[in-house]
């Protein structure tokens, strides 16, 4: 268990970066800060959790930006970001900070956020090492910030799995060595057996291997089976595995803010009320009282005290914070063409000509529910449609009476006549067929075309 | 205009569940939060759950372990199942819709009084 | 949860009067995730007010929201003989959602 701590320096415009606010003349705003923890050093998605922990800062002095002095650092928030982590540090891990700019003019809603900038270091670093400072870039923006990564007694190490006593927490028993010195910090960890467990031995002198609670064994590799030896408190022994009388590490309740503590192998463990963390619970966590959903998000506490919260986001809003505007627009919803315009309550689409409805699905020009007239078919094809009219009607939609004869039909000087049917072509001398096509031969035999495959001479005919 | 109407048995018998469906017109389900309120007789209005067309829900801790709130996208509705009821659950129940710049309620239907007595 | 506590729980006016109705928090109201709503007897609630201090499309200008934290008034600058109904406020910042338990403003 330990601490993970960040303290920024300064957030302002980098050298070379914008002369002044890229955000000028908006009103009164404030920054915050957020940080996020992911273990290990491959690239995560964005939306993948903050696995390590993640602390939101308090918010900045509020100020106004000037539309034409150039752009000082930013006034920041007081104060350490602290991101408390309950078991090993992991050594290798991704740190993500995000600089909010929350604005304090009349906005609908309430405030407004925007995320100035955003960076992500991938960093190897020991707990228990010195502050590492760094420099980072966004955009115009520049932030400088320091980190490092603490333990918390009884933990101790480079990935703080190591447990040690303080020496104030030693007493003298009968047929114990004598104490230490009472010095409110830990004994320098001595050398321990070659191969002792790193999780289940411990050593008080160099090259001695004693086993916690529940493991035996000279290296303390063997689980004890049944232990008789349970409720017992003090440095286990070097030939049973089991506990000798000693003092309890509960004795004057080290749990900060209300937390309770119960006693573990070797150490002790405080139950946190929500919003607190750390080893004493003297670390405040995110929680929904901080207000960490943005943009009108709804903070959904866990079930129990150690859950974090998540973010339900109002429609055209995501990420972990309800940070990120969704452009809707990018999923095409508007069909056939359509122009999608994301206006924030709502998504809109200007459809083309020929096309209607909320996202442009509607044919205007399709057979779908469009009748042709006097019995007319609709026949759809490249993007329209098109009425094939039944004999005696035209038009669009076939409304129109149509005169069968005004295009002359009648091949060879053939009288037309328009009929409730159609049309009947009198033919002149020496032709015949419907539209008197067919030159009549001398001999009586009408020039007809060459019967079709299968068909004898002389057979009945049929022609369209 | 968004229009809600809630429709179900206005008499419960003790134990059962009631069950209410609230219709929406004038708009598709998608892309919104919809939620259940009720009042008792009398009373203070008190939220029940909500539904967002994804399938998330979040429910009153209070009534949690009784709730349940469904989604029919094909028919535009959402329905509120609220089991083992007793008279306390006696009220008007509201739908409604939740607001795109957070979760108040900007459209709501005209209530059912549901009464359970045996 | 946030307890919402309204105050006064009746308050009886005349038309033209200004009504000023006080919303209290148990814990700050992130972000003033708060709402408003009027009630008229037999009919479902009415938004007014959002993000404390937003009117809802068509509410008249008569009506204004303001505070932030845990402290949130509504103001009815001119009460109209529509205006008497029970008003009450609602927090969206932290589930689960919360009503206050309401204010009746009645005809003196």
């Known amino acids: 268990a330990g601490v993970f701590e960040l303290q920024i320096h300064s957030f302002g415009p980098g050298p070379g970066g914008a002369p002044r606010s890229p955000y000028s003349a908006r009103g009164p705003c404030r920054l915050f800060f957020r940080v996020c923890l992911k273990p290990g050093l491959s690239e995560e998605a964005a939306e993948s959790p903050c696995a390590l922990g993640a602390a939101l800062s308090a918010r900045g002095p509020v100020y106004t930006e000037q539309p034409e002095a150039p752009a000082p650092d930013l006034p920041l928030p007081n104060g350490l970001l602290q991101v408390p982590f309950r078991d090993a540090w992991p050594g290798t891990f991704s740190l993500i900070i995000e600089t909010w700019r929350e604005e304090l003019g009349d906005q609908i809603g309430g405030p407004a956020w925007s995320l100035l900038a955003r960076v992500t270091r991938r960093r190897r670093l020991a707990a228990g090492g010195p502050w590492a400072g760094d420099i980072q870039r966004a955009g115009a923006w520049e932030l400088r910030f320091s980190y490092r990564a603490r333990c918390e007694l009884p933990a101790v190490g480079t990935a703080c799995t190591r447990l040690c006593r303080p020496r104030s927490a030693s007493r003298c028993g009968p047929g114990l060595r004598p104490c230490a010195p009472l010095e409110d910090e830990c004994e320098a960890p001595p050398v321990c057996r070659a191969g002792c467990s790193l999780e289940h031995g411990f050593c008080e002198q160099p090259g001695e291997c004693r086993c916690l609670e529940g493991w035996t064994g000279p290296l303390c590799m063997v689980p004890v089976s049944t232990s008789s030896c349970l409720g017992l408190r003090g440095p286990s022994s070097t030939t049973t595995g089991c506990l000798v009388p000693g003092p309890g590490p509960c004795d004057g309740n080290p749990c900060a803010n209300g937390g309770s503590c119960s006693e573990t192998p070797g150490s002790f463990e405080c139950t946190c009320p929500r919003g607190f963390y750390g080893l004493r619970c003297e670390v405040s966590g995110v929680t929904c009282a901080d207000g960490p959903c943005f943009n009108g998000g709804l903070c959904v506490g866990g079930a129990d005290p150690d859950s974090a919260y998540i973010c339900h986001c109002p429609p055209g809003f995501q990420g972990s914070n309800c940070e990120k505007r969704v452009d809707r627009c990018s999923l095409q919803p508007c069909r056939n063409g359509g122009l999608c315009l994301d206006l924030g309550h709502a998504l809109r689409c200007r459809c083309r000509a020929g096309f209607a409805g909320p996202r442009c699905e509607h044919d205007l020009n399709d057979c779908a529910g469009r009748a042709c007239a006097n019995g007319g078919t609709c026949v759809e094809g490249g993007g329209a449609h098109r009425c094939s009219c039944a004999l005696g009607f035209g038009g669009r939609d076939c409304r129109e009476r149509a005169d069968p004869c005004a295009a002359r039909p009648c091949a060879h000087g053939g009288r037309c006549y328009a009929h409730f049917s159609g049309l009947v072509c009198a033919c002149a001398p020496g032709y015949m067929g419907a539209r008197c096509e067919f030159p009549v031969h001398p001999d009586g035999v009408s020039a007809l075309p060459a019967a079709p495959p299968g068909l004898r001479p002389g057979d009945p005919q049929r022609y369209p | 205009q968004v229009q809600l109407q809630e429709s179900g048995p206005g008499l419960v018998k003790p134990s059962e569940t009631l069950s209410l469906t609230c219709t929406v017109s004038?708009?598709?389900?998608?892309?919104?939060?919809w939620s259940w309120i009720r009042q008792p007789p009398g009373k203070g209005l008190e939220w029940i759950g909500y539904i967002f067309y994804s399938g998330i829900t979040n429910y009153n801790p209070s009534l949690k372990s009784r709730v349940t709130i469904s989604l029919d996208t094909s028919k535009n509705q959402f329905s509120l199942k609220l089991s083992s009821v007793t008279a306390a659950d006696t009220a008007v129940y509201y739908c409604?819709?939740?607001?795109?710049?957070?979760?108040?309620?900007?459209?709501w239907g005209q209530g059912t009084l549901v009464t359970v007595s045996s | 949860e946030i307890v919402l506590t309204q105050s006064p729980g009746t308050l009886s006016l005349s038309p033209g009067e200004r009504a000023t109705l006080s919303c209290r928090a148990s814990?700050?109201?992130?972000?003033?995730?708060l709402a408003w709503y009027q009630q008229k007897p037999g009919q479902a609630p009415r938004l007014l007010i959002y993000?404390?201090?937003s009117r809802a499309t068509g509410i008249p200008d008569r009506f204004s929201g303001s505070g932030s934290g845990t402290d949130f008034t509504l103001t009815i600058s001119r009460l109209e003989p529509e205006d008497f109904a029970v008003y009450y406020c609602?927090?969206?910042?932290?589930?689960?959602?919360?009503f206050g338990g309401g204010t009746k403003v009645e005809i003196k």
């Open positions: 814990q700050s109201v992130s972000s003033s995730y």
């Open positions: 993000g404390a201090s």
């Open positions: 004038g708009g598709s389900i998608n892309s919104y939060y």
């Open positions: 409604a819709r939740i607001g795109v710049a957070g979760f108040y309620f900007d459209y």
């Open positions: 609602q927090q969206y910042g932290t589930s689960p959602l919360t």
